[in-house]
């Protein structure tokens, strides 16, 4: 049940973000998943490392590894997915899943190639009046529902605003998505729910904006969280710039 | 040289608990899966239990559950293994060990305290 | 259940000792074998069926599949008058062999 001769699925993630690594296999049988081991291939002649494993309901994280690796998977449907939070550069490289099943000898192998790239910046400036996009994506190897998308805002004021909320109701395949208070009519949602990607744009930005903006993206019962700064500059004077004197002139507000 | 220090000899009385400990020394303790073995003329050796000091995790051997209670301190590296109700039965040797892992769902016992 | 066999034997040195342990299930190659001196605490000598741990000597090796596995001692020696175990790590409870005490 070897997987590794496809070429395996490829997860692009940033320094400090989350990646979900899918281990799942389908079995006609009514056999339930017995041991897991989650092994890092780094490559470039580095030696192996051991990631996780699995057995008789004891789930054990390994070395560097420990307090940032999950089983997010329906271990009793044959699902052995590997969480990785706050990923970092040293854990870039080939993730090998085996799934053993009790009494079989053959083991299911899956690979994920997960690369690393550079911190993306948590701090984010504005202008007064602009429009400024702001990056919430989940990285993972498995298409899962997005059930909830949240953006919450904490500014200096300390109450919490919910501005965006995104909600899509598996039975009912409802699909409802609001902007709230003093965002109303200002956030959009730009991201790829479908590729778990929560992204927003907020336009007309206001001094108040300024804040932290906090997102989650719900996927059943796994929750991905990112917290953004947004600084606001006041509004910046448009120039205009004459080629005699290239001297800065301020227009007014009815100036054209 | 890793090492597993064990607590000494104890004297109990019928009814009575005892605890055990089992020191970890140059090794990280949280990295590596601890359990206990009892050894009797007439059973030999016999699995208790592990614990997990990384996750803290526990796994008991059936014939165990109610008599033995495993723990762990993570800052002083110590295993501890707690007996109950305690009768003739118990009086005997008992060893922590240290299991490694192999890779590909391969444990085995590499380190033995003194018992 | 692990049935190991024999219950003891000698043997002189140079000569070669083999002692069995039989599962009652396939255990896929989770097998160790371990030494156990008088008074001390068991050593480990051989994992996953016949990989031997660093620091033992190559006299000693391990073979086997499904649920027959065995432990050869190729020329016995003085200082391997000891009892050795199996122990099988397929699945929990780990369980042990009653145990074969090997004399000079």
């Known amino acids: 049940l070897n997987d590794l001769n496809v070429s395996p699925p490829e997860l692009t993630v940033h320094v400090g973000d989350s990646a979900l690594m899918g281990c799942v296999f389908q079995s006609t049988e009514d056999k339930c998943i017995f041991k897991i081991d989650w092994t890092l291939s780094p490559g470039e002649h580095a030696k192996d490392e051991y990631v996780l494993y699995y057995y008789s309901n004891l789930s054990v994280p390994i070395g560097r590894f420990q307090n940032r690796v999950h089983l997010m998977g329906d271990i009793l449907c044959n699902d052995g997915s590997l969480l990785l939070q706050d990923v970092q550069e040293a854990d870039q490289g080939t993730y090998i899943c085996e799934i053993r099943l009790k009494g079989e000898s053959q083991v299911f192998k899956k690979a994920v190639v997960l690369h690393v790239l550079p911190e993306e910046p948590k701090e984010l400036m504005v202008h007064v009046g602009g429009l400024i996009q702001m990056g919430c994506v989940f990285q993972s190897t498995e298409v899962k529902h997005v059930t909830k998308v949240e953006w919450i805002f904490s500014g200096r004021r300390a109450k919490e605003e919910i501005v965006f909320r995104y909600y899509h109701k598996l039975r009912m395949s409802v699909e409802y998505s609001q902007s709230w208070g003093h965002f109303q009519n200002r956030v959009n949602l730009v991201g790829d729910i479908f590729r778990n990607d929560g992204s927003i744009m907020l336009q007309g930005v206001r001094e108040s904006d300024g804040g932290n903006y906090t997102c989650s993206i719900h996927l059943g019962n796994l929750v991905f969280k990112k917290t953004i700064v947004l600084h606001v500059s006041p509004e910046e004077p448009r120039t205009l710039v004459t080629p005699a004197a290239l001297r800065p002139l301020v227009l007014g507000g009815n100036q054209l | 040289d890793v090492q597993l220090v064990e607590s000494g000899a104890e004297l109990v009385r019928p009814g009575a608990s005892v605890k055990l400990s089992c020191k970890a020394l140059?090794?990280?303790?949280?990295?590596?899966?601890m359990h206990w073995v009892k050894q009797t003329p007439v059973h030999g050796l016999e699995w208790i239990g592990i614990i997990h000091p990384g996750s803290g995790g526990t796994v008991y051997n059936q014939k165990f559950k109610g008599k033995a209670t495993l723990t762990a301190d993570k800052s002083s590296s110590t295993a501890y293994m707690e007996l109950s109700s305690l009768t003739s039965e118990d009086s005997t040797v008992y060893y922590c060990?240290?299991?490694?892992?192999?890779?590909?769902?391969?444990?085995?016992?590499?380190?033995w305290g003194a018992g | 259940v692990l049935t190991q066999s024999p219950a003891s034997l000698a043997a002189s040195v140079g000569e070669t000792v083999t002692i069995t342990c039989r599962a009652s299930e396939n255990i896929y190659y989770s097998l160790a074998w371990y030494q156990q001196k008088q008074g001390k605490s068991p050593q480990l000598l051989i994992y996953n069926a016949n990989s031997l741990e660093d620091g033992v000597p190559s006299r000693f090796s391990g073979s086997g599949s499904g649920t027959q596995y065995s432990l050869k001692i190729n020329s016995m020696q003085p200082e391997d008058t000891a009892t050795y175990f199996c122990e099988q790590t397929y699945d929990v409870p780990l369980t042990f062999g009653a145990g074969t005490k090997l004399e000079l």
């Open positions: 140059a090794y990280t303790f949280t990295d590596y899966e």
């Open positions: 060990t240290r299991r490694r892992y192999y890779g590909s769902s391969y444990w085995y016992f590499d380190v």
